[in-house]
Interface confidence: low
C-alpha cells in the first residue's frame, strides 16, 4: 500500500512483497526489500525509532537506493505496519504484517504492564481499547470489571479490529475500573493487558472574560485580562489566546485551576493575560478560547488603547433644553474620554447636590421640573489622571401652561346687584406669555341644571354653547379692555379685564388663555340678583380671633325664609372645560348656619356672628331668600377672608446720625403686623413727648426734630407693639457745634 502525495517525478518506493497484508507464522524470518529513487528509511511497529536490536536494516548489494529489513524469529508483538519511505517526504509504501502467535494473540506494548483508556460519559462517543491482534480474524470480547461484564461485537457500535482494537460506546464502560480484551482459540482463553478506565469530562459551561467590555487604557498602562472557564468535573482545559500584537515582549500568560467549594459539581480554570505596558498596536479584539478536547468555547472583548488620557464633550451634547412644568428632565453628559471623567454639575455657578428632586450624575435628572429650575447649567468634566477640564453650558427653559390666578383666589360663584357696573378679571401667568386671552359667555338659564335634571359627573351643564363677547345680544353689554402687564408676586403676569356696563342678566363668563405648551381657563358665574344684600361688620377682612358678623338684608314685602349657609367642599371641583354649578340649584354643597333675625320697618336682617374668627372660617357664605309670590330661591354669595395674626416687625433700620445744632432731623419707622401695631418713640428710654420742636406724624411713623439743640442728643428708640408683642429699632443722634446764647442771657 502507498501513502502520501507523489512529489514531482518521484515514484513510490517498491516493496519486494507486493501485498497490503502479509500473514506469517511465529518463529519464522521476516524479510522485506525496499527499492526507490533516493535515500530510504524503514519504520516498524512498537519501536518506530530504528534502535530495536532484533531488527536489522541493511543496504542491498545490488542497488544504490535499496534497503532490506530482516527480523529473525518473529513474535506476535512484531505484528503491525511496516513502512518504507523517502527521507523528509510523505512518500511511503506500507505493508501490514500479522505474525500469527496462537499463544499470544494480542500485541502487547513493550513498556506497559497495563494501559490507560480515557473516556467521556457522552452517549454519542465511542472509545477504542487498543488491544491489537496478531491474528486478523479472532473472536474477541471485552471484559469490564467490577462488577464483571462482557461485551461482544454486535456488528454495529461494538466491534473489534485487529489493527485498531476494541470499539465500544464510552458510557457502557464508564462504571468500570478496568477493562481487557479476551480471545478464544481452540477453547483456550487469551487476555490482553489490563486497561485502567479514566472517566474525563468535556463539557465547558461558559467562558467569561473580565473585564467583559468597555476596556480602555492609555499607552504605558498595564492590561490584565482574566479568562475563567467553568466546566464539569474531570475536565482538563487548554487555553488559547488571540490578540492583536502577538509578538509582545511584555506579555505574560498564567493558567491555573481555581478552588471550588467542596461538593461542587463544577470546576473553574483561570487564564490571565497580562501586558505590562500597552502600546497603540495592542488595541483590538482579544479572544480567549478554552478547549477540553471535545469542546471549545470562546469569548472576546475589545480593548481600546488611547495615546494619552483625555476628555471631550460628545457631538450630541445639548445646549438648549426645553421642558414643561411637571415633566421629568434628563440632560445626559455626553462625553468621550479616558479614563471616565469626574462629572460635576453647577446651576448658575452653584454646585448641584443630588437629593429626592434632582439627581446629578452622568445624567442630570430633575424629577418634576418647576419654574425655579430655569437657568444655566454647567457640566464640568475632569480627567482624573491629567486633571484636564472641559465645561459646557446647557440652558434649561421651563415653560408654564397658562395658570389663571383668580381660580384659586375667587369663589367660583358670586352674586352681583342688578344694574351695577362690574369688572371681571383674569390674571394669567404663563411661560411664554399667552399669545391670546379670549372671553366667551352664555346665559345662565340656558346652561344651569334644573333641580329635576340628573347631574352628569363629567358634564355638570347640559349645554356648552359659548358665544364670543363681541356678540352680546340678549346678554349684558360688554367691553374688553386691552391686556395689561403687571409684576405680581415677582412674576410677570398678563391681566385681561372684561367690563360689564350694567348687570342685567345672569350669565356665565369664560376667559381662555393659550400659549405654546397649553391652555388654561376660568369660568365665572355672574349671577345677577335684585335680592338680598350682604355686608360685613365691622371689617371687610377680619384678623384671626377678631369678631366679625355677616348681615343679610332683604325687603320683607318681597322675600321670606332668609337662611345663612356656608359653601362646603364641593364634590365636583371645577376642571378645565367644566362650569360651576349655580349655588341655588345645588343645595347639597351648603352647610346651614345658626343666625339671628332682626327687623326694621322695611327689611328683615339675618345676622350670623363669628365671635372668634379663625382661618378655618374663611370661605364662601351664602344668604338664601325665597320670593314670597313665586317661591323662587335667590342666593347671594360673599367670600370671607380671615387674615392671619402676625407679630409686629419694623422694616428698615434707624441709622446713627450726626447733625449740627440748628438743623433738622427727619426719620421714619415703618412697622407692619396684624393687628396693626401702635408705634411709640423713646429718647434715652423715656417716652418722647411732642412739643414745638418735636413733631410726630402718620400714626407716629415719622419723627421730625426741628432746630436741634445739644440736649436733643441721645439714644432714640422706635417701638411697635400689638397684642402679639413688640419690635424696636434704635439709633444714636449726635449733635455737633456750640450752643448759641439766647438774647435773654
Amino acid at each position: 500500500a502507498s501513502v502520501g502525495l507523489p512529489s514531482v517525478s518521484l515514484d513510490l518506493p517498491r516493496l519486494s512483497i507486493q501485498k497490503d497484508i502479509l500473514t506469517i507464522k511465529a518463529n519464522t524470518t521476516l524479510q522485506i526489500t525496499c527499492r526507490g529513487q533516493r535515500d530510504l528509511d524503514w519504520l516498524w511497529p512498537n519501536n518506530q525509532s530504528g534502535s530495536e536490536q532484533r531488527v536489522e536494516v541493511t543496504e542491498c548489494s545490488d542497488g544504490l537506493f535499496c534497503k532490506t529489513l530482516t527480523i529473525p524469529k518473529v513474535i506476535g508483538n512484531d505484528t503491525g505496519a511496516y513502512k518504507c519511505f523517502y527521507r523528509e517526504t510523505d512518500l511511503a509504501s506500507v505493508i501490514y504484517v500479522y505474525v500469527q502467535d496462537y499463544r499470544s494473540p494480542f500485541i502487547a506494548s513493550v513498556s506497559d504492564q497495563h494501559g490507560v483508556v480515557y473516556i467521556t460519559e457522552n452517549k454519542n462517543k465511542t472509545v477504542v481499547i487498543p488491544c491489537l491482534g496478531s491474528i486478523s480474524n479472532l473472536n474477541v470480547s471485552l471484559c469490564a470489571r467490577y462488577p464483571e461484564k462482557r461485551f461482544v461485537p454486535d456488528g454495529n457500535r461494538i466491534s473489534w479490529d485487529s489493527k485498531k482494537g476494541f470499539t465500544i460506546p464510552s458510557y457502557m464502560i464508564s462504571y468500570a475500573g478496568m477493562v481487557f480484551c479476551e480471545a478464544k482459540i481452540n477453547d483456550e482463553s487469551y487476555q490482553s493487558i489490563m486497561y485502567i478506565v479514566v472517566v474525563v469530562g468535556y463539557r465547558i459551561y461558559d467562558v467569561v472574560l473580565s473585564p467583559s467590555h468597555g476596556i480602555e487604557l492609555s499607552v504605558g498602562e498595564k492590561l490584565v485580562l482574566n479568562c475563567t472557564a467553568r466546566t464539569e468535573l474531570n475536565v482538563g482545559i487548554d487555553f488559547n489566546w488571540e490578540y492583536p500584537s502577538s509578538k509582545h515582549q511584555h506579555k505574560k500568560l498564567v493558567n491555573r485551576d481555581l478552588k471550588t467549594q467542596s461538593g461542587s459539581e463544577m470546576k473553574k480554570f483561570l487564564s490571565t493575560l497580562t501586558i505590562d505596558g500597552v502600546t497603540r498596536s495592542d488595541q483590538g479584539l482579544y479572544t480567549c478560547a478554552a478547549s477540553s478536547g471535545l469542546m471549545t468555547k470562546k469569548n472576546s472583548t475589545f480593548v481600546r488603547v488611547h495615546e494619552k488620557p483625555f476628555v471631550a464633550f460628545g457631538s450630541g451634547m445639548e445646549s438648549l433644553v426645553e421642558a414643561t412644568v411637571g415633566e421629568r428632565v434628563r440632560i445626559p453628559a455626553k462625553y468621550l474620554g479616558y479614563p471616565p471623567p469626574e462629572i460635576k454639575w453647577y446651576k448658575n455657578g452653584i454646585p448641584l447636590e443630588s437629593n429626592h428632586t434632582i439627581k446629578a450624575g452622568h445624567v442630570l435628572t430633575i424629577m418634576e421640573v418647576s419654574e425655579r429650575d430655569t437657568g444655566n447649567y454647567t457640566v464640568i468634566l475632569t480627567n482624573p489622571i491629567s486633571k484636564e477640564k472641559q465645561s459646557h453650558v446647557v440652558s434649561l427653559v421651563v415653560y408654564v401652561p397658562p395658570q389663571i390666578g383668580e381660580k384659586s383666589l375667587i369663589s367660583p360663584v358670586d352674586s352681583y346687584q342688578y344694574g351695577t357696573t362690574q369688572t371681571l378679571t383674569c390674571t394669567v401667568y404663563a411661560i411664554p406669555p399667552p399669545h391670546h386671552i379670549h372671553w366667551y359667555w352664555q346665559l345662565e338659564e340656558e346652561c344651569a341644571n334644573e333641580p329635576s335634571q340628573a347631574v352628569s359627573v363629567t358634564n355638570p351643564y347640559p349645554c356648552e354653547e359659548w358665544r364670543s363677547v363681541e356678540d352680546f345680544q340678549g346678554g349684558n353689554k360688554i367691553e374688553v379692555n386691552k391686556n395689561q402687564f403687571a409684576l405680581i408676586e415677582g412674576k410677570n403676569k398678563t391681566v385681561s379685564t372684561l367690563v360689564i356696563q350694567a348687570a342685567n342678566v345672569s350669565a356665565l363668563y369664560k376667559c381662555e388663555a393659550v400659549n405654546k405648551v397649553g391652555r388654561g381657563e376660568r369660568v365665572i358665574s355672574f349671577h345677577v340678583t335684585r335680592g338680598p344684600e350682604i355686608t360685613l361688620q365691622p371689617d371687610m377682612q377680619p384678623t384671626e380671633q377678631e369678631s366679625v358678623s355677616l348681615w343679610c338684608t332683604a325687603d320683607r314685602s318681597t322675600f321670606e325664609n332668609l337662611t345663612w349657609y356656608k359653601l362646603g367642599p364641593q364634590p365636583l371641583p371645577i376642571h378645565v372645560g367644566e362650569l360651576p354649578t349655580p349655588v341655588c340649584k345645588n343645595l347639597d354643597t351648603l352647610w346651614k348656619l345658626n343666625a339671628t333675625m332682626f327687623s326694621n320697618s322695611t327689611n328683615d336682617i339675618l345676622i350670623m356672628e363669628l365671635k372668634n374668627a379663625s382661618l378655618q372660617d374663611q370661605g364662601d357664605y351664602v344668604c338664601l331668600a325665597q320670593d314670597r309670590k313665586t317661591k323662587k330661591r335667590h342666593c347671594v354669595v360673599r367670600q370671607l377672608t380671615v387674615l392671619e395674626r402676625v407679630a409686629p416687625t419694623i422694616t428698615g433700620n434707624l441709622e446713627n446720625q450726626t447733625t449740627s445744632i440748628g438743623e433738622s432731623i427727619e426719620v421714619s419707622c415703618t412697622a407692619s403686623g396684624n393687628p396693626p401695631p401702635q408705634i411709640m418713640w423713646f429718647k434715652d428710654n423715656e417716652t418722647l413727648v411732642e412739643d414745638s420742636g418735636i413733631v410726630l406724624k402718620d400714626g407716629n411713623r415719622n419723627l421730625t426734630i426741628r432746630r436741634v439743640r445739644k440736649e436733643d442728643e441721645g439714644l432714640y428708640t422706635c417701638q411697635a407693639c400689638s397684642v402679639l408683642g413688640c419690635a424696636k429699632v434704635e439709633a444714636f443722634f449726635i449733635i455737633e457745634g456750640a450752643q448759641e446764647k439766647t438774647n435773654l442771657e
Epitope: G326, P569, L572, P573, E578
Partner: nanobody
Framework: QVQLQESGGGSVQAGGSLRLSCVAS????????MGWFRQAPGKEREGVAG????????YYANSVKGRFTISQDNAKNTVYLQMNTLKPEDTAIYYC?????????????????WGQGTQVTVSS
Amino acid sequence: QVQLQESGGGSVQAGGSLRLSCVASGYSVSKNSMGWFRQAPGKEREGVAGINYGGTATYYANSVKGRFTISQDNAKNTVYLQMNTLKPEDTAIYYCAAGSPDPPPLIEGVVKYWGQGTQVTVSS
C-alpha cells in the same frame, strides 16, 4: 405626614365579592388622583384601577374591567375598590396609591405615596 391605610382584604370563594377601603390622612383624595395596585406572588406590582381628582374619570386594567369599581368619598377622605366576580388569579396583596392631581396612578412611576397593602385570597 401622609398615610394611606387599606382594609377590607380577606379570603373569598371564586365568584364572590370584596370591598377594599383606603383612608388617607394628611392628603386630600378630592384634590389628587388615587389608585389601586396589586402584587401576586412572584409577579410584579401592577395597576388595577385609578380615579382622577374630583372623581370625574375612572380607569381600569383590562383584567378587571367590568368586575371592579373604584370610587371615592371626599367627606371621609376615602377611596374604595369594589371587587365582584372574583377569580383565583385576583389573589394578591392590594395596595392603595396616591398621585398628583394628574395623571391618575396607573403605573408605579407616578405614585407619590403607598399604603402598606391588604391581602386578598380567592380560592377555587
